[in-house]
């Protein structure tokens, strides 16, 4: 595989050719790490250290802010707690969300007192509102950790917010929580390692399973110690895990909990010389591309290895079907801490645990009218045997000769003048973003990845944790703890003045236009449009 | 109803062993977590030890640590503490109680206790 | 000492309202945790009074209620009888080490 990027732009030169547009934050702010996009109003919100930023789409430069920090005796509490002042005593947002038309909801760590508001954005781009609504302040327990340096995963729909975080102060009770509404806080089992054990949340999601909304899930993408027995030594693993969006909790032992959560180990490995596979276990991001059917996005995961000595990062593409039948597979079991996982080989109870109470599937209204034999298996069984297996079963990135890892991941669907391609952009621990085209062989799942640029988008070496793509404004943002940067999807002057150059870079945002490299567009009727994606073959498409 | 009746307590030599049980009935005692706690002569109540539903999750105070060992057999719907090397400063009644997890946040209360036991730790 | 701080005792006549307070820190109450309140009669088990701030059990009078803000929390009791003579514990969560605490407790003395 060519691993050498077509091209390769440090800071200066991307600053030089005006590719990079960046905020360089603020002085008594810092962690510019949760993004919201709105295409509509043409904004990207920031959560940040005191802080949540509006920036305007178009420029970055451009920007509103709210100044939302802690009292001064809440941050002498945290200080009194043994905690850094700087890094850990202020308000870090952590939550950023749609709330309705006119509102967001934003929650910070709250000086270690987690804490959640509204913030005002008016009906209309023009209203040019935004504001703090100051008389409405909530507990952000359940949604927002405590401790800044945790990670949280968030979605708010309908009126209610799931978030994947930790509940206490000390960060040990970790809890997929749905919060807000008119309902009960509901959440996965406490003191259990086999429902989750120490993990790190990613993302959420909402997928529908069928047309009728009463099945639709909410899916968890994290990453969490693997539970002993499992694997010989410590070991991390990728999780999906799932919720459906109607469970209202069950009965008995499971009141005001999940009764639908089951989870699966995500594979994203490569066969080793020596028979055993380099696994990437280290979830770090997800994106899903959502294309033709909503039912049924591709799911592309970034990965890391847990090893201090080897150090490798990789993508993995999954499905959605491949998701579902795991679920629908057996449930790992275990007779006692001592035994090994083995696939359930029992009479599995009716309704099957994981089923959302709905007319599709089956004839139950509520998961409050679980059998008990239902409660008792979904309490012990929350995890499934088989895990889920990346597209083609192996990934469609790899990197392990590089003094980097990747961080981020966003996913662009592009019409060529062959076809459609997915270009990846990948954010880096060292603040760098390649761009990555998957190119299918024989089938469209069989790809080759051609790294098309690395580009420095960081004055210093910082680590990418945020990053959202419009493709309104052709644009990708990036965060990181020292700001946010902000470039364009393609720079095809730079591919060269040759036809021959643009047409070796196979950069589908790119074709020979009879003059110039320029951005190709599917809807121009040009003929001299010279582009080959698949082949890169400039002989072919080139008459100079 | 729920009943939970504690035994095993007595008069015991410092250094030496015992083993309370806690038998409960009235509830789903598989559901449950379950807990001691002591409360000596004269003083206030101390948590001892908490036990998840399936002995998955199992924490002590640091005052008993390494010492005390707590258990239970859903079986039997019965909760154990065994004690080892006692000392004078755990003389105390013991009781045993049920998490009962009744607020929103799902922060552990006590909703039933028992009468408790009496241990006696002298020489 | 305990975690969590009451006052040693309260005295009220009857048909009196008391308070009895509970203090604690940012990492027990102050950090957003629920605060439980059981009463204890002389020579019996303690028993669950609030839960959750301010929730009764059912068969608790309305006598009794629960508040929290900041660090500290606090038990009303109204119209005093001489049955509410006792004593009365707050607990709170605390995360590992130890998992819960408890406050010294509180003796109610009903005067006359």
């Known amino acids: 595989k060519n691993n050498v990027p077509r091209l390769k732009l440090s800071y200066k030169e991307m600053l030089e050719s005006n590719n990079v547009i960046t905020f360089n934050g603020l002085a008594n702010s810092s962690s510019y790490h949760t993004f919201l996009l709105d295409e509509e109003r043409s904004r990207l919100y920031v959560g940040a250290k005191d802080h949540i930023f509006s920036f305007d789409l178009v420029n970055i430069k451009d920007f509103q802010k709210i100044v939302w920090p802690v009292s001064y005796t809440r941050r002498d509490e945290c200080k009194w707690a043994g905690k850094d002042i700087l890094k850990e005593c202020a308000n870090f947002i952590k939550v950023l969300k749609a709330y309705n038309q006119t509102h967001l909801y934003a929650c910070g760590t709250g000086a270690f007192h987690p804490i959640c508001t509204y913030i005002e954005i008016g009906h209309h781009p023009e209203d040019n509102i935004f504001k703090l609504e100051n008389s409405h302040f909530e507990n952000g327990r359940g949604k927002s950790p405590y401790d800044p340096k945790l990670l949280t995963a968030s979605l708010l729909i309908d009126g209610e917010l799931y978030s994947g975080t930790a509940a206490d102060f000390m960060g040990r009770d970790f809890a997929i929580f749905r919060t807000l509404g008119h309902h009960h806080p509901i959440r996965t089992e406490q003191h259990d390692s086999r429902w989750l054990n120490d993990p790190k949340f990613i993302s959420a999601h909402l997928i529908s399973e069928s047309d009728n909304p009463e099945d639709d899930k909410v899916y968890f993408f994290f990453r969490e110690n693997a539970i002993d027995g499992e694997h010989s030594g410590k070991a991390t693993h990728a999780r999906i895990g799932q919720i459906c969006k109607n469970d209202f909790g069950g009965h008995r032992s499971l009141v005001n909990k999940w009764t639908t959560f089951l989870k699966a180990r995500l594979i994203c490995s490569v066969p080793g010389p020596n028979g055993i596979d380099t696994h990437f276990d280290e979830l770090q991001d997800v994106f899903l591309m959502n294309f033709k059917d909503p039912k049924n996005p591709v799911v592309y995961g970034v990965f890391t290895t847990s090893s201090n000595i080897f150090k490798g990062s990789a993508v993995c593409m999954y499905s959605m079907s491949d998701v579902r039948r795991v679920f629908l597979g057996p449930y790992a079991h275990r007779d006692g801490p001592n035994y090994q996982w083995v696939p359930y080989q029992g009479r599995v109870p009716y309704p099957r645990p994981g089923t959302c109470p709905s007319k599709t599937f089956g004839g139950f209204d509520s998961t409050k009218d679980l059998p008990d034999d239902v409660i008792t298996f979904a309490r012990s069984h929350p995890a499934m045997y088989n895990p889920v297996f990346p597209m083609n079963n192996r990934p469609i990135v790899i990197k392990t000769d590089v003094n980097y890892q990747f961080t981020q991941i966003v996913v662009d669907r592009v019409d060529a003048e062959d076809g459609q391609y997915d270009v990846m952009f990948i954010g880096t621990d060292v603040g760098t973003v390649l761009k990555v085209v998957s190119i299918p062989k024989e089938t469209w799942y069989d790809l080759e990845e051609v790294l098309l640029e690395e580009m420095t988008v960081f004055r210093e070496p910082t680590a990418i944790s945020a990053m959202e793509l419009s493709t309104k404004q052709q644009q990708l943002y990036i965060g990181s703890t020292a700001g946010v940067a902000q470039l364009p999807l393609h720079r095809c002057d730079i591919y060269g003045k040759a036809c021959a150059e643009c047409c070796l870079a196979r950069d589908p945002y790119c074709a020979w236009d009879g003059s110039a490299c320029s951005r190709y567009f599917p809807t121009a009727k040009r003929a001299t449009r010279a582009q080959d994606i698949r082949n890169g073959d400039p002989l072919t498409h080139c008459s100079d | 109803e729920v009943q939970l009746l504690e035994s095993g307590g007595g008069l015991v030599q410092p250094g030496g062993s015992l083993r309370l049980s806690c038998a409960a009935s009235g509830f789903d005692f598989d559901s449950y977590e379950m807990n001691w706690v002591r409360q000596a002569p004269g003083k206030g109540l101390e948590w001892v030890s908490g036990?998840?539903?399936?002995?998955?999750?199992?924490d002590y105070a640091d005052s008993v640590k390494g010492r005390f060992t707590i258990s239970r057999d859903n079986s039997k719907n019965t909760l154990y503490l065994q004690m080892n090397s006692l000392r004078a400063e755990d003389t105390a009644v013991y009781y045993c109680?049920?998490?009962?997890?009744?607020?929103?946040?799902?922060?552990?209360?006590?909703?039933?206790w028992g009468q408790g036991t009496l241990v006696t730790v002298s020489s | 000492q305990s975690v969590l701080t009451q006052p040693p005792s309260v005295s009220g006549a009857p048909g009196q309202r008391v308070t009895i307070s509970c203090t604690g820190s940012?990492?027990?109450?102050?950090?957003?945790?629920?605060v439980h309140w059981y009463q204890q009669l002389p020579g019996t088990a303690p028993k669950l009074l609030i839960y959750g701030n301010s929730n009764r059990p059912s068969g608790v009078p309305d006598r009794f209620s629960g508040s929290k803000s900041g660090t500290s929390a606090s038990l009303a009791i109204t119209g005093l009888q001489a049955e509410d003579e006792a004593d009365y514990y707050c607990q709170s969560y605390a995360g590992p080490n130890p998992y819960v605490v408890f406050g010294g407790g509180t003796k109610l003395t009903v005067l006359g």
């Open positions: 036990i998840s539903w399936n002995s998955g999750w199992i």
């Open positions: 109680a049920r998490s009962g997890y009744s607020s929103s946040w799902f922060d552990p209360d006590f909703d039933y």
């Open positions: 940012s990492s027990n109450i102050g950090a957003g945790y629920d």
